[in-house]
């Protein structure tokens, strides 16, 4: 088999809500992936599992099943949403995210995604990790690639 390429493109949107009493932040983060099938036969994207980390703590997980079939020599763009919760020992972030005196409330999140594809009964997993900026202070729609956080921690691809 030839390669199936998975490219994490970035955060597409982040929608924020708060629980004032619990000092909790709810972030619904939609991400975009490009999956390219370089084979001469179709492959099925069986599932996508994703998790989001803030400060080395997992704050959200998601799993999508039976997503799509990608034809040979074809590419599909897939969006997936991870609901995240910043609470409890990280409730100090509530003050930062709701601070009126600053315009942009960017936090750095690590996006991890694993794509499982199948073909001819064979299964293959491809994983990616990316650090991204997300504004926890307002609903934001991003230009693809705009939210990328570039620093020495960013895994090389």
């Amino acid at each position: 088999p030839r390669s199936i390429d998975v490219k994490y493109i970035g955060v597409k949107s982040a929608y924020v809500s708060y629980d004032v009493q619990k000092r909790t932040i709810y972030l619904n983060i939609t991400n975009t992936l490009n999956i390219t099938n370089n084979n001469y036969y179709s492959v099925e994207v069986e599932n996508i599992t994703a998790q989001v980390q803030f400060s080395k703590t997992v704050i959200g997980k998601a799993r999508l099943n039976n997503i799509t079939i990608i034809g040979p020599l074809d590419m599909k763009q897939i969006d997936y949403t991870v609901p995240t919760v910043i609470a409890e020992e990280m409730s100090y972030m509530y003050d930062f995210c709701t601070l009126i005196s600053i315009k942009v409330h960017n936090i750095v999140l690590m996006m991890q995604v694993t794509v499982t594809t199948t073909y001819f009964g064979h299964s293959e997993q491809i994983s990616q990790e990316r650090y991204q900026y997300v504004d926890c202070g307002r609903n934001t729609t991003y230009q693809l690639g705009q939210s990328e956080y570039l620093n020495v921690l960013q895994p090389q691809q």
């Epitope: 036969y41 179709s42 099925e44 034809g71 040979p72 020599l73 074809d74 199948t118």
Partner: antibody
Framework: QVQLQQSGAELVRPGTSVKVSCKAS????????IEWVKQRPGQGLEWIGV????????DYNEKFKGKATLTADKSSSTAYMQLSSLTSEDSAVYFC???????????????WGQGTSVTVSS | DIQMTQSPSSLSASLGERVSLTCRAS??????LNWLQQEPDGTIKRLIY???SLDSGVPKRFSGSRSGSDYSLTISSLESEDFVDYYC?????????FGGGTKLEIK
């Protein structure tokens, strides 16, 4: 019934280009790949490349990169192969062939075009 | 690239005779092999796919088999229209490669 109808014979000058067509009928054009194969006079068969007419995605034999360009027009169910900077080495019969695919099976080149003769001569 | 060595390059045989043509793969190709027939006017037809599966409309006298890296096309009883050219094709990996061909001639 399934048919791949190729364009007629071409006599072309060295250094020029030629575009060979392969019109598909009798099946859903975008559900199959189209492959292209070269046969020099009195010789064997050589694989050039493949196109997915649905996506426009292509893959080429390294040997033919820069020489052949594969395209497809969904509206007319026609695949094309353009050959550029022609030399006498490009004089050959060129075939298109259909390639069924799914995520379960892959049994290529089940139907073939009749071939297009390209002669490069000054 | 995977090399497909086809033998013999030409074969003289009589009507009704049983003949076998062979292709040897330089690397493992599993069952990803076709046998093709080319008539004198250039028309190409697939006879066998996946090593041993007969295409619809192909006479039962044609059969395909495998032994290790050797792939065979057998014609059990030659008829007049069988005296044409035959090629094997591997599609296990890119680029696809063909055998050099066998010219089947009437004795």
């Amino acid at each position: 019934q399934v048919q791949l109808q190729q364009s007629g014979a071409e006599l072309v000058r060295p250094g020029t280009s030629v575009k060979v067509s392969c019109k598909a009928s009798g099946y859903a054009f975008t559900n199959y790949l189209i492959e292209w194969v070269k046969q020099r006079p009195g010789q064997g068969l050589e694989w050039i490349g493949v196109i997915n007419p649905g996506s426009g995605g292509t893959d080429y034999n390294e040997k033919f990169k820069g020489k052949a360009t594969l395209t497809a027009d969904k509206s007319s169910s026609t695949a094309y192969m353009q050959l550029s900077s022609l030399t006498s080495e490009d004089s050959a019969v060129y075939f298109c062939a259909r390639d069924p695919y799914s995520k379960y099976v892959h049994y290529p080149m089940d139907y073939w075009g009749q071939g297009t003769s390209v002669t490069v001569s000054s | 690239d995977i090399q497909m060595t086809q033998s013999p390059s030409s074969l003289s045989a009589s009507l009704g005779e049983r003949v076998s043509l062979t292709c040897r793969a330089s690397q493992d190709i599993g069952s990803s092999l076709n046998w093709l027939q080319q008539e004198p006017d250039g028309t190409i037809k697939r006879l066998i796919y996946a090593t041993s599966s007969l295409d619809s409309g192909v006479p039962k006298r044609f059969s395909g088999s495998r032994s290790g890296s050797d792939y065979s096309l057998t014609i059990s009883s030659l008829e007049s229209e069988d005296f044409v050219d035959y090629y094997c094709l591997q599609y296990a990996s890119s680029p696809r490669t063909f055998g050099g061909g066998t010219k089947l001639e009437i004795k």
